[in-house]
Amino acid sequence: YDFTNCDFEKIKAAYLSTISKDLITYMSGTKSTEFNNTVSCSNRPHCLTEIQSLTFNPTAGCASLAKEMFAMKTKAALAIWCPGYSETQINATQAMKKRRKRKVTTNKCLEQVSQLQGLWRRFNRPLLKQQ
């Protein structure tokens, strides 16, 4: 999916009001010095591409993020503010239902959510312009 035509400001507002708080809840008890951000993004569409990938695609050691509250709210925000996004996700959702697993918060998942916070932070940053 090409995130170029999303309403970035509306997504940002949704993130600040709810999604960010759910991410903090998920990370509660984790030290703020524990993880360095290694996943990066260069502009807002790219950030959303990386956020989608890290939130919804299972990875080795962390298969369960898509069922978390922050993930469901992320999906809703993208569906509302990115034209045509929900249609592209129908097949992906059906595939995900087939491989639903028990929720387990592993250290790998905590690291992945820390990376997500970093990607969202880059997405939210003001436009950094060289004067």
Epitope: K12, L16, S17, S32, N36, N37, R121, R122, L127, Q131
Partner: antibody
């Protein structure tokens, strides 16, 4: 807990340079931008610029372009702000601040460094 | 550069009063606005981000609203510790300019 500790007060002569340090602790230094803001006596807040400690990328207010240099030392988790060709109008308190978790504000601030420029 | 205009520049009020400070941006900044409180000799403290989100630990008597070019900070019932100077700052693009400040004084 997150802390930003700045260097002590400075007295400089016009034309000189000053380098203010901001030592960060309690968080992953390279994950967050650092902002520099100054405040002249009895005046409001004035935004000077931002540095990305990870990349070293800087974004300066036009007013300070050519006179300010922001750097960051990853090994010591310290940000620096150097201001050159000082004049009396540069007398102010200089603050560093850390970007918030969400990237939508600056949530932790240093205690401030007082600079006096006088002949 | 985006200019931020705050009003009033100073305001006298009493403990228990409801006060509202406004901030106007010279162009559309959506919801990219923060509010800070500053007391003499201290660093600013973050109150509100994203125009309406209260920073953790900030009392619920503070609230932010607005979007586009018009924003406000409201204190529903002034407490003695609220007498300070308040600044808005836009967060849309660099340079991240501040408002001119509003000094809230005891009547």
């Amino acid at each position: 807990q997150v802390q930003l500790v700045q260097s002590g007060a400075e007295v400089k002569k016009p034309g000189a340079s000053v380098k203010v340090s901001c030592k960060a602790s309690g968080y992953a230094f390279t994950n967050y931008l650092i902002e520099w803001v100054r405040q002249a006596p009895g005046q409001g807040l004035e935004w000077m610029g931002i540095i990305n400690p990870e990349s070293g990328d800087t974004y300066y207010a036009q007013k300070f372009q050519g006179r300010v240099t922001m750097t960051a030392d990853k090994s010591t988790s310290t940000a620096y702000m150097e201001l050159s060709s000082l004049r009396s109008e540069d007398s102010a308190v200089y603050f560093c601040a850390k970007e918030s978790l969400t990237g939508s504000s600056y949530d932790y601030w240093g205690q401030g460094t007082t600079l006096t420029v006088s002949s | 550069d985006i200019q931020m205009t705050q009003s009033p520049s100073s305001l006298s009020a009493s403990v228990g009063d409801r006060v509202t400070i406004t901030c106007r941006a010279s162009e559309n900044i959506y919801s990219n606005l923060v509010w800070y409180q500053q007391k003499p000799g201290k660093a600013p403290q973050l109150l509100v981000y994203g125009a309406r989100n209260l920073q953790s630990g900030v009392p619920s008597r503070f609230s932010g609203s607005g979007s586009g070019t018009q924003f406000s900070l409201t204190i529903s019932s002034l407490q003695p510790e609220d007498f300070a100077t308040y600044y808005c700052q836009h967060f849309y693009e660099t340079p991240l300019t501040f408002g001119t400040g509003t000094k809230l004084e005891i009547k």
